[in-house]
Amino acid sequence: CKAMHVAQPAVVLASSRGIASFVCEYASPGKATEVRVTVLRQADSQVTEVCAATYMMGNELTFLDDSICTGTSSGNQVNLTIQGLRAMDTGLYICKVELMYPPPYYLGIGNGTQIYVIDPEPCPDSDF
């Protein structure tokens, strides 16, 4: 297993609709044809997997059916979007990239993106 640098933004603020997007960029030492990207969430020293996708030559990442993630790839960049976030989901979201093929296997883990989620205030009752 060889190490690889992964860069991601330090902070992202989710939209009022609970959507957060960020770019995960990896320094590929060669031309990988198969890449696996995993988003991990770290909160209170616990790490959980949010979503994962293996992609090849296309530009759209395909996630499992119940996933809250979507994404696209371009070169060594992966554009990730996490949906359905609420205030309780605020935390550090870490991008993990694995170059699965061809050998050698490379692994890179980013420093994480702190995603802040603020639940929208309920609309006040209208007189109209």
């Epitope: 044809t33 198969e34 696996r36 293996t54 992609y55 090849m56 030559m57 296309g58 530009n59 759209e60 395909t62 996630f63 499992l64 059916d65 996933s67 979507t70 696209t72 699965m100 093929y101 061809p102």
Partner: antibody
Framework: QVQLVQSGAEVKKPGASVKVSCKAS????????INWVRQAPGQGLEWMGR????????YYNEMFTGRVTMTRDTSTSTAYMELSSLRSEDTAVYYC????????WGQGTMVTVSS | DIQLTQSPSFLSASVGDRVTITCSAS?????IHWYQQKPGKAPKLLIY???TLASGVPPRFSGSGSGPEFTLTISSLQPEDFATYYC?????????FGQGTKLEIK
């Protein structure tokens, strides 16, 4: 030019297994997914699963989990799809298709399940 | 699973007509891809990533849309366009296809 050539038609009895092959040529086999799609007579297209030929990573349609196995042989640039516990409803044309965009397809393999 | 519903399922049209086929997803998807299939033949990729024409596909075919609603348009039908058309999504597993739209000669 890119080609996906599939094995010939099969007739199987219920409960048996079938293994269909898909030989790729004209491109780097390990750079693209191989997908398997089936089409029952007069029906639409149904995605069964896919394999990444380099690592062997597979994704299966849950509808077929436990019955389908996808493998590959990189030395011959051939992908395989095996379907077990066959029933009459599995009678269909089975296609392999390349990549994320299904931009090249095999000619199809007719599998008939009949007692 | 993401369901894709095509409308109409059957369409009768004449050479030279402009036709539009709609593909509606049960959940928002990033892209839609379109295939053409003729009887006894394997499907053929027409449009990928919603609006990009596959190699060798004539410009009378076009695709558009976003979120849950996408369309395939044929600006001026040619005799060779009479076939069945399928949309497909690959935002989430399992990859799914629409039920198909059969385009017939009026």
């Amino acid at each position: 030019q890119v080609q996906l050539v599939q094995s010939g038609a099969e007739v199987k009895k219920p409960g048996a297994s079938v293994k269909v092959s898909c030989k790729a040529s004209g491109y780097t086999f390990t750079s693209y997914w191989i997908n398997w799609v089936r089409q029952a007579p007069g029906q639409g297209l149904e995605w069964m699963g896919r394999i990444a030929p380099g690592s062997g990573t597979t994704y299966y349609n849950e509808m077929f989990t436990g019955r389908v196995t996808m493998t590959r042989d990189t030395s011959t640039s051939t992908a395989y799809m095996e379907l077990s516990s066959l029933r009459s409803e599995d009678t269909a044309v089975y296609y392999c298709a390349r990549g994320d965009y299904f931009d090249y397809w095999g000619q199809g393999t007719m599998v008939t399940v009949s007692s | 699973d993401i369901q894709l519903t095509q409308s109409p399922s059957f369409l009768s049209a004449s050479v030279g007509d402009r036709v539009t086929i709609t593909c509606s997803a049960s959940k928002s998807v990033s892209y839609i891809h379109w295939y053409q299939q003729k009887p006894g033949k394997a499907p053929k990729l027409l449009i990928y990533d919603t609006s990009t024409l596959a190699s060798g596909v004539p410009p009378r075919f076009s695709g558009s849309g976003s979120g849950p609603e996408f369309t395939l348009t044929i600006s001026s039908l040619q005799p060779e366009d009479f076939a069945t058309y399928y949309c497909q999504q690959r935002t989430t597993y399992p990859l799914t296809f629409g039920q198909g739209t059969k385009l017939e000669i009026k």
